[in-house]
């Protein structure tokens, strides 16, 4: 039981893409405020988003400290203007989040095709290595830095004149594919982490086609 007129948060949900991680919950506060705490399974609780009227809290700074850890958060409810007030058990009302392991669960953001270059009947397609908010030695790591070979990309490519999508895979950020001479091709990529059980695929990149300015053509 909690303080009179204070409602416990519910529907605690992790929203995370490329490790940018926000905890969301309900309800919109009426005469109450929230504080969030986060901890690893074995760690101490750290408070964030003190006495907020928002129903979300950005926990990125905490989870990027170790993306392979499993985190738990909880949302405390306090009466507005009386945040020292506690429930009958001597503690404010709170609700726990589901556990969250960023490395296994963060959504893969939509990739971007950085460039493609044709040399004769070969095309080299390069995927942008997106920067994350995960740091090592004061440097922001890229998605590839974090996931290494766990992250692969699937390239879908097709002749502009047809609809059938051929596929290629890479565990780097580059593809080298064979194409027919004199044909224009279109490309789309998808990030995949095959070892995962959830959130295995990203949405597809925007389609890029030969004959547009991202590409370069060299006849050899």
């Amino acid at each position: 039981s909690g303080t009179t007129n204070t409602v416990a948060a519910y529907n605690l949900t992790w929203k995370s893409t490329n490790f940018k991680t926000i905890l969301e919950w309900e309800p919109k506060p009426v005469n109450q405020v929230y504080t969030v705490q986060i901890s690893t399974k074995s760690g101490d609780w750290k408070s964030k988003c003190f006495y907020t009227t928002d129903t979300e809290c950005d926990l990125t700074d905490e989870i990027v400290k170790d993306v392979k850890q499993t985190y738990l958060a909880r949302v405390f409810s306090y009466p507005a203007g009386n945040v020292e007030s506690t429930g009958s058990a001597g503690e404010p009302l709170y609700e726990n989040s589901p556990e969250f392991t960023p490395y296994l669960e963060t959504n893969l953001g939509q990739p971007t095709i950085q460039s493609f270059e044709q040399v004769g009947t070969k095309v080299n397609v390069t995927v942008e290595d997106e920067r994350t908010l995960v740091r090592r030695n004061n440097t922001f790591l890229s998605l590839r830095d974090v996931f290494g070979k766990d992250l692969i990309y699937t390239l879908y490519y097709w002749k502009s004149s047809s609809s059938g999508k051929k596929t290629a895979k890479t565990n780097t950020n580059e593809f080298l594919i064979d194409v027919d001479k004199g044909e224009n091709y279109c490309f789309s990529v998808q990030a995949v982490i095959p070892s995962r059980t959830v959130n295995r695929k990203s949405t597809d990149s925007p389609v890029e086609c030969m004959g547009q300015e991202k590409g370069e053509f060299r006849e050899i």
Partner: antibody, heavy 121, light 107 residues
Amino acid sequence: EVQLVESGGGLVQPGGSLRLSCAASGFTIPAYWIHWVRQAPGKGLEWVGYIDPSNGYTYYADSVKGRFTISADASKNTAYLQMNSLRAEDTAAYYCARADYHGVDEYWDYWGQGTLVTVSS
Amino acid sequence: DIQMTQSPSSLSASVGDRVTITCRASQDVNTAVAWYQQKPGKAPKLLIYSASFLYSGVPSRFSGSRSGTDFTLTISSLQPEDFATYYCQQHYTTPPTFGQGTKVEIK
């Protein structure tokens, strides 16, 4: 438990149509890739086509291009093979299979039990 | 399309024999080769993936190897339940292609 169950096979006249279903359970199809493979009586395995159910992308074997269409309905967790303008040489057992990756190498770890399509007048 | 030439097309062997089946790719396919076992009236079953990785639940008497564009499936000691047809398959490029199959029969 992961399972793929095909249905919809049967006897059809040349030039006719048939729609095969591949109902998946134990996993969600948009997280994987679904292939269709066929096997004529007494013959080897022949790849028919694939779909990525997350985006609808498909590719077909030359032997069925323009006649067969693969689709998927994520809400039903089911993939389909629509077969039009059927010919006697399309007579076969049709299998759907789930594809996954080990690194960049694909493998097909779960297969349906197969459904027999007979094209004959 | 990449051709997978499988040999032999059939072989006769006895229980306990060492059996080797080979597949040659018409061009480089890296390690993107899988091997399947099929029994009459049944769907194929995955045995080996990525040329040499044993699929979960498959007995350790099965193994796969690669040398350039040549791929080998070996059954170290043939068991009664191993009499079946075996197929290699490449997934390196679209379309994926199968070998013609090797029927392993009882001598």
